[in-house]
């Protein structure tokens, strides 16, 4: 079944942008001017998920790349990774659970909770130039709030 998708950029609540750091990692840092062109463009898709009143299930792919953010156990810890997929089959309505994030929107701020690992969120560090990761705490030092901007192509 076809899915609704959009193209967007994400910035954390400290206005750090997300950029590629090697082939399979994202990092967060402050960008200005022409450097803004480095930021990753996501293809966010509306997918099937658990019934909820306030969470909207989405998948986060990298635009025009066959890479999706996914959540897996590594050394017994929930971990965020970029995973290659067959572009002929993605995005799809019924994404595997590791690709699904529950988008929680409060006062124009977005959180992305792992569907596979409840209460684990896409997170950035306070420090500059650090990897984007899956964090198990909200409201602490690490940042779990993002803003979204559509990208005009």
């Amino acid at each position: 079944a076809p899915v609704r998708s959009l193209n967007c950029t994400l910035r954390d609540s400290q206005q750090k942008s997300l950029v590629m750091s090697g082939p399979y990692e994202l990092k967060a840092l402050h960008l200005q001017g022409q450097d803004m062109e480095q930021q990753v463009v996501f293809s966010m898709s509306f997918v099937q998920g658990e019934e909820s009143n306030d969470k909207i299930p989405v998948a986060l792919g990298l635009k025009e790349k066959n890479l999706y953010l996914s959540c897996v156990l590594k050394d017994d810890k929930p971990t965020l990774q970029l995973e290659s997929v067959d572009p002929k089959n993605y995005p799809k309505k019924k994404m595997e659970k590791r690709f699904v994030f529950n988008k929680i929107e409060i006062n124009n701020k977005l959180e992305f909770e792992s569907a596979q690992f409840p209460n684990w969120y896409i997170s950035t560090s306070q420090a500059e130039n650090m990897p984007v990761f899956l964090g198990g705490t909200k409201g602490g030092q690490d940042i779990t709030d993002f803003t979204m901007q559509f990208v005009s192509s």
Partner: antibody, heavy 119, light 108 residues
């Protein structure tokens, strides 16, 4: 305060074209999706389509081909281009804001603009 | 495309009555359903989303329930301001977003 104001409606001949506008304030088109919905006289609501970014638009099957949604974020304006108009396109046309990305529901509406297709 | 069917099409009731409007989807849409109220010459107003969550500022006499393909809108005690047309809307089943045909609530 969220406000949406449609304009551009009027009388058009069958086969003609018309472009409707929806100017918004109190929020940005760079982070909210927008739909067009119409209502023929004495009839129910009919969804036309939705726009996210400029490249991501989705339409009701009946609207594909004749109706095109676009926007100019710098002008806070949404558009509906309607071509090959027919008598059955006579309706009040509303623009509406999606409450949250992919929520599908609409929490802000314009007052509507009337389109009459007649010779 | 998913088709939304409301019943009844028209409903006569009195102030103080308990009113129930139903909406059926042609296939399962989980809880991706909204309800709107529309008065003549006005824009629709969002009442309920995700089948059961009350939109901001909506009186608590309105409630929604259901999941899958069967949904209901209930007005527990009808007030004079509630006479209007009510629409259900599929918000999440596939790419399209579809409304029901509407239920007109009139004074008995």
């Amino acid at each position: 305060e969220v406000q949406l104001v449609e304009s551009g409606g009027g009388l058009v001949q069958p086969g003609g074209s018309l472009r409707l506008s929806c100017t918004v304030s109190g929020f940005s088109l760079s982070s909210y999706a927008m739909s067009w919905v119409r209502q023929a006289p004495g009839k129910g609501l009919e969804w036309i389509g939705i726009i996210y970014d400029s490249a991501s638009t989705y339409y009701a099957s009946w609207a594909k081909g004749r109706f095109t949604i676009s926007k100019d974020t710098s002008k806070n304006t949404l558009y509906l281009q309607m071509n090959s108009l027919r008598a059955e396109d006579t309706a009040v046309y509303f623009c509406a804001r999606e409450r949250q990305i992919f929520s599908g529901d609409m929490d802000g509406w314009g007052q509507g603009t009337t389109v009459t297709v007649s010779s | 495309e998913i088709v939304m069917t409301q019943s009844p099409s028209t409903l006569s009731a009195s102030v103080g009555d308990r009113v129930i409007i139903t909406c059926q989807a042609s296939q399962s849409i989980d809880n991706w359903l909204s309800w709107y109220q529309q008065k003549p010459g006005k824009a629709p107003k969002l009442l309920i989303y995700r089948a059961s969550t009350l939109a901001s500022g909506v009186p608590s006499r309105f409630s929604g329930s259901g999941s899958g393909a069967e949904f209901t809108l209930t007005i527990s005690s009808l007030q004079p301001d509630d006479f209007a047309t009510y629409y259900c809307q599929n918000t999440g089943g596939g790419v399209s977003i579809a409304f029901g045909q509407g239920t007109k609530l009139t004074v008995k």
